[in-house]
Amino acid sequence: ASTQSPSVFPLTRCCKNIPSNATSVTLGCLATGYFPEPVMVTWDTGSLNGTTMTLPATTLTLSGHYATISLLTVSGAWAKQMFTCRVAHTPSSTDWVDNKTFSVCSRDFTPPTVKILQSSCDGGGHFPPTIQLLCLVSGYTPGTINITWLEDGQVMDVDLSTASTTQEGELASTQSELTLSQKHWLSDRTYTCQVTYQGHTFEDSTKKCADSNPRGVSAYLSRPSPFDLFIRKSPTITCLVVDLAPSKGTVNLTWSRASGKPVNHSTRKEEKQRNGTLTVTSTLPVGTRDWIEGETYQCRVTHPHLPRALMRSTTKTSGPRAAPEVYAFATPEWPGSRDKRTLACLIQNFMPEDISVQWLHNEVQLPDARHSTTQPRKTKGSGFFVFSRLEVTRAEWEQKDEFICRAVHEAASPSQTVQRAVSVNPGLAGGSAQSQRAPDRVLCHSGQQQGLPRAAGGSVPHPRCHCGAGRADWPGPPELDVCVEEAEGEAPWTWTGLC
């Protein structure tokens, strides 16, 4: 199973089930669904003394992951005290930790309903200079609530003093307002109102709805590729309009910038498709610095037959950044594949999803048509991954047996690139005496014999060999041992393999 971080849940009793004269009380913390072991659970009991007991981990039957419970027993003035259970899982990462802060017991309560309302457009369907979002938190049992606004998952610095609470009978309602600039709203970010109440989280999210397009015609606006942006340093964006009916009227694609600054000269291409429709593309060079600094570009599509203009905008992706991890592999030789081999490259855990993948051989970039790379897909976590596949020929690896898989991504440091090298026959190319490679599994052979005969993967030591502790003069991977025959009066036989 692969590494999996735990989900952490507080374990509390109902307040009404705890006797009022109880001098001590036990609460717990459940960490579940993690792999591998161990987790470390610690408690912050504030000013109170407490004793803890962490139960041995149990295996979850279906997944093979683990679950464990830590119990804390406290005495004294526990009723008003909050307790924090801190769960660390170093196999996930050295600093992976999840804190849960909660009180000894849970009261019966009515949870809030969270709903975001947004201000209207003007009569012409255009957005005003500022947009108001109103978070309504309604119908909850009176108690402390915390409201946080998030933009694409990141906490926003918002003045919450304007939040107002009213009580209707036994239930309360609160509302909080967020004012956004038109630029922020149009940038396609997601806004979330997150409410914490009684140790639970409730939320609602909203973003600018996609325009309802005139039927049948679609427009798309691409971001520059990381390769164009960081390596060629000549980024372009492309506005693509598809499914246009050919007609006498001209399609106009007009570029603009949210800052109002002028745009570069664009190039335009029209293509008639097999199904009779027209595809129009307009490519606009953009300034590397302008793009990196977050400029928003708009493409406006007009046509006499369109009921109204189509608008598309693009800007640098916001949100957290993470550099890609890159791993490269070569497939083994199979019958019928002696003269070609497949190389693969796994690129994972990067954010945002914009990435360019290249293969290089002999310090020359191979044409994109040579390799096949998947579209970015989400990992189980918050990042993305792609696979890239390259077929190489014997002529290529005999010329130089080193192929480079390179990922270009904005979060990669220092030069926006991460690369790996892979060889078809690692360690054998060149045959340098200065750099050695432990051989594949080798049959027991005479020390006097020249050349080590290769055997199939399932070879075993000669029956009279025993496993030694590795040969100091063979600097191969440490898991390879050498078997030495102890026959008297003849040169020893050896077998190198996994003992």
Epitope: Y327, E402, I404, V422, S435
Partner: nanobody
């Protein structure tokens, strides 16, 4: 041809320091993770530490806080700075190169002897 050449080994007193170098040629150095291994007489070879191609380092518990790895991609060289040396650090030290990122060290140097008296 790929070559990994260690240097800087020698005899040093306990508590002293040494700096090992490993010069690589014939490979695209910036694409490789580099590792240092050591093998004492009669013992299994053990990993001392590794440095990823992005500069992130990992060390065995036995050397943590005493040994430091670094790399100079412009010079195609990886270094192992060894401080507070102990007699049990006596071994042949090998450098190794892994291009895949998977921990498969494809290329190995010949080793350099470090003796701590």
């Amino acid at each position: 041809d790929v070559q990994l050449q260690e240097s800087g080994g020698g005899l040093v007193q306990a508590g002293g320091s040494l700096r090992l170098s490993c010069a690589a040629s014939g490979l695209t150095f910036g694409s490789y993770d580099m590792g240092w291994y050591r093998q004492a007489p009669g013992k299994q070879r053990e990993l001392v530490g590794r440095i990823r191609n992005d500069g992130i380092t990992y060390y065995a518990d036995s050397v943590k806080g005493r040994f430091t790895m670094s790399r100079d991609n412009a010079k195609n060289t990886v270094y192992l700075q060894m401080n507070s040396l102990k007699p049990e650090d006596t071994a042949v030290y090998y450098c190794a190169a892994d291009g895949t990122g998977l921990g498969h060290y494809d290329y190995w140097g010949q080793g350099t002897q470090v003796t701590v008296s």
